[in-house]
């Protein structure tokens, strides 16, 4: 049994949220990447995902969300640029495999977002917001949604839970339909 | 509770080798990448060298690159150090450590082992 | 290589006292930073990631600031378990992960 492990990260509106997911690069190098929100009740919403197959060093950007897999590396670069408030939540990395169910990276990303800036005078909190330049309107992804055939009657743990895994990537839902995704607007 | 345990430290004669071990328990081995770094006497923290969790990706730093191995088995929740052509410059204390899983921060420490390299 | 530059070197304060402690970067990391305590015979223990999250167990009296190249670290009441050496360490994408050279916060 794998258990299934948390870090928090508490940032400021306006930071950047910057993770990094590690992967097989044998196995998944061009797989589909995607990242995840997971809400209370609710199985996980993929907000945003790298091309099919995944591109090598190419960002691919949804809103205010970043995504670079590097092939060479096995690590798919997640960030969350000016970050809002409402984008506080618990947030996962997966591959995806069809037909094969998709796998979770460790760990899953307890993100906490509060108001105000926690910077000493002179410090360059923002540098983030003038670097990236986020265009007000950008493409929506079309990834993959996978939900499972039962009703969800019961939030995901908050804290660790065993489950049982292959190597480090642990299964999700089995593939049930592939919907557009609405994103951070 | 995590767990890390460095073994195989020593005295050693320039140009000599030596494999430092860790072991690894509560939490998934495989799931994390490792890392080794060290400490000089009197000196600063100077990273060495990190395995992806798989171990199918490795780094090393340009001090020890082509002279350092490392190397980890994911059935026995161990990392290794192979350590070859030692100079008196790799004499410090060796930490395992496990790197956290979202960024490369090392979350936990070993107490290390003294790697002595003299004539 | 990213150089990594603390200061002061040492950091003389009375218990009770509030510690400022920085780190610069060579060039922007974001929040790409961590801090460690390490006290003499010990191993490194993680305080403070991502600049500004405290670690499992961290005392509340830690706390980090900064983003981009400028950083601090302030413990608000130091207590005496705090007199130690603080590193900072970037981790903003590829080896080499690099570490400042130390701060030593001793008994004034």
């Known amino acids: 049994a794998t258990k299934l492990t948390e870090e928090k990260y508490e940032l400021k509106e306006g930071q950047t949220l910057d993770v990094k997911c590690d992967y097989t690069l044998e196995k998944f190098a061009s797989s589909q990447k995607a990242w995840q929100i997971i809400r209370d009740g609710e199985m996980p919403k993929t907000l945003a995902c790298t091309e099919r197959p995944s591109k090598n060093s190419h960002p691919v950007q949804v809103g205010r969300i970043i995504l670079e897999d590097y092939h060479d590396h096995g690590l798919l670069r997640v960030r969350m640029v000016n970050l809002q408030v409402e984008d506080s939540g618990l947030y996962q990395c997966v591959i995806y495999q069809p037909p094969k169910e998709p796998h979770m990276l460790f760990d899953r990303i307890r993100l906490v977002v509060t108001k105000g800036f926690s910077g000493t005078p002179g410090s360059n909190e923002n540098s983030t917001q003038n670097v990236y330049k986020i265009p007000p309107t950008t493409t929506k992804a079309l990834c993959p949604l996978y939900t499972s055939p039962r009703t969800v009657t019961q939030a995901p743990p908050k804290s660790t839970a065993d489950v049982s895994t292959p190597d480090s990537e642990i299964n999700l839902t089995n593939v049930t339909d592939i919907i557009r995704v609405p994103v951070f607007n | 509770e995590v767990q890390v345990l460095e073994s195989g430290g020593g005295l050693v004669q320039p140009g000599g080798s030596l494999r430092l071990s860790c072991a690894a328990s509560g939490f998934t081995f495989n799931a994390y990448a490792m890392s080794w770094v060290r400490q000089a006497p009197g000196k600063g923290l100077e990273w060495v060298s990190t395995i992806s969790g798989s171990g199918s990706t490795t780094y090393y730093a340009d001090s020890v690159k082509g002279r350092f191995t490392i190397s980890r088995d994911n059935s026995k929740n161990t990392l290794d150090l192979q350590m070859n052509s030692l100079r008196a410059a790799d004499t410090a204390v060796y930490y395992c450590?496990?790197?956290?899983?979202?960024?490369?921060?090392?979350?936990?420490w070993g107490q290390g082992t003294l790697v002595t390299v003299s004539s | 290589e990213i150089v990594m530059t603390q200061s002061p070197a040492t950091l003389s304060v009375s218990p009770g006292e509030r510690a400022t402690l920085s780190c610069r970067a060579s060039q922007s990391i974001n929040a790409n930073l961590a801090w460690y305590q390490q006290k003499p015979g010990q191993a490194p223990r993680l305080l403070i990631y991502?600049?500004?999250t405290r670690a499992t167990g961290i005392p509340d009296r830690f706390s980090g600031s900064g983003s981009g190249t400028e950083f601090t670290l302030t413990i608000s009441s130091l207590q005496s378990e705090d007199f130690a050496v603080y590193y900072c360490?970037?981790?903003?994408?590829?080896?080499?992960?690099?570490f400042g050279q130390g701060t030593k916060v001793e008994i004034k």
């Open positions: 991502g600049a500004y």
């Open positions: 360490q970037e981790f903003i994408m590829w080896p080499p992960w690099t």
């Open positions: 450590a496990k790197v956290a899983g979202s960024n490369f921060f090392f979350d936990h």
